[in-house]
Amino acid sequence: QNSKLQEELQALRETFSNLTASTDAKVKTLSMQGGNVGRKMKSLESQLEKQQQDLSEDHSSLLLHVKQFVSDLRSLSCQMAVLQGNGSERTCCPVNWVGYEGSCYWFSRSGKPWPEAEKYCQLENAHLVVVGSWEEQKFIQHHVGPVNSWIGLTDQSGPWKWVDGTDYESGFKNWRPEQPDDWYGHGLGGGEDCAHFTEDGGWNDDICQRPYRWVCETQRDRDSGS
């Protein structure tokens, strides 16, 4: 009787030992799997975060494209109306240009030195903006915002001159107090040479190599086929 009990006890011990070993192995496996799941989750979280960011950027980009598309559509409709009417008057501006009074304006987003900015405008059959009135000043100021922006005024050849030949002396001016100072201390020879809108819209003269935004202007009183 006693030896039978001992045999059963031994069998139970073995079963328990096997069960413990099996449980340990399962716990270890689960622990490893848990670690993997944790790592996988972290990886998925970071992927999801990146996808959300990309999606947010795509959404913003898409909105911009839609706005641009609407603007382009308006511009093309206008130009089609001009062509159908066979008129010689150009009442619309090129795509991406903004109309005001008798001119079309293009506002840069990037920055360039004054000579490069003027060259850019010329390639667009335009010139750096010539500000002729307080109304035009306010219109431009509204579009450029609080960022330095080149205008078509320079004294590189001596006296101050507008790029389109408009008379400077008798024309509109909006210099900041004590400007233009035509400061010679920049070591470039000659004065500061180029005029720009400052953050508050007042004009300042500065070194022409500064990388400021710029505004192009072209007349829209004649149809140039654009």
Epitope: R109, S110, G185, G187, L188, I207, R210, P211
Partner: antibody, heavy 120, light 107 residues
């Protein structure tokens, strides 16, 4: 207080990519231009790239042009530098720095830097 | 690109000394010049901008002068915390460029 904290540095093999981040706090991030500047071990400072306050203008040093891309997310107050086709000579401490204005003025606030090591 | 030449590349000085570092540019940059201080293992710290304007919180012992192509940084009375490397940088146009640095060491 005004703070810039870089992250994302590490050891990477030549030809691989890495993306650095710079978290900004204590100021209105969306009104300032931001720059990346690097410093190779035992060397001087080298300007890498600038992005204007609104992301409209980006400029790069010739040494990274076509390989690195600077970007920003103003909603998250974060600046990024995506570095592709990395070379051994890109090994450096990378600092993000705030422009005093929209992007064409001097640097006034710097982060503590994050180290990038390009090695096989 | 605008080249920046700093001199000397290193100098030894004593506490209380007046120290002058010069920076020369390859073309005129007006006053679009900044000065930075960097201590070993630390990020650079902005000292001056527009050649002579002190950043807020920077002590008045630091001063800058110059315009065009020649600039100087002066520390009127050197203190132990001023031993560091100093860099000039032009921001007149892109790419921004730095001088090679001037290491100020204890004599």
């Amino acid at each position: 207080q005004v703070q810039l904290v870089e992250s994302g540095g590490g050891v990477v093999q030549p030809g691989r990519s890495l993306r650095l981040s710079c978290a900004a706090s204590g100021f209105t991030f969306s009104t300032y231009g931001m720059h990346w500047v690097r410093q190779a071990p035992g060397k001087g400072l080298e300007w890498v790239a600038v992005i204007w306050y609104d992301g409209s203008n980006k400029n790069y040093a010739d040494s990274v042009k076509g390989r690195f891309t600077i970007s920003r997310d103003n909603s998250k107050n974060t600046l990024y530098l995506q570095m592709n086709s990395l070379r051994a000579e890109d090994t450096a401490v990378y600092y993000c720095a705030r422009d005093q204005g929209v992007g064409y003025d001097g640097l006034d606030v710097w982060g503590q830097g994050t180290t990038v090591t390009v090695s096989s | 690109d605008i080249q920046m030449t700093q001199s000397p590349s290193s100098l030894s000085a004593s506490v209380g000394d007046r120290v002058t570092i010069t920076c020369r540019t390859s073309q005129g940059i007006g006053n679009y010049l900044a000065w930075f201080q960097q201590k070993p293992g630390k990020a650079p710290k902005s000292l001056l901008y527009k050649a002579s304007s002190l950043q807020s919180g920077v002590p008045s012992k630091f001063s800058g002068s110059g315009s065009g192509t020649d600039f100087t940084l002066t520390i009127s009375s050197l203190q132990p915390e001023d031993f560091a490397t100093y860099y000039c940088q032009q921001y007149m146009t892109y790419p921004l460029t730095f001088g090679g640095g001037t290491k100020v060491e204890i004599k």
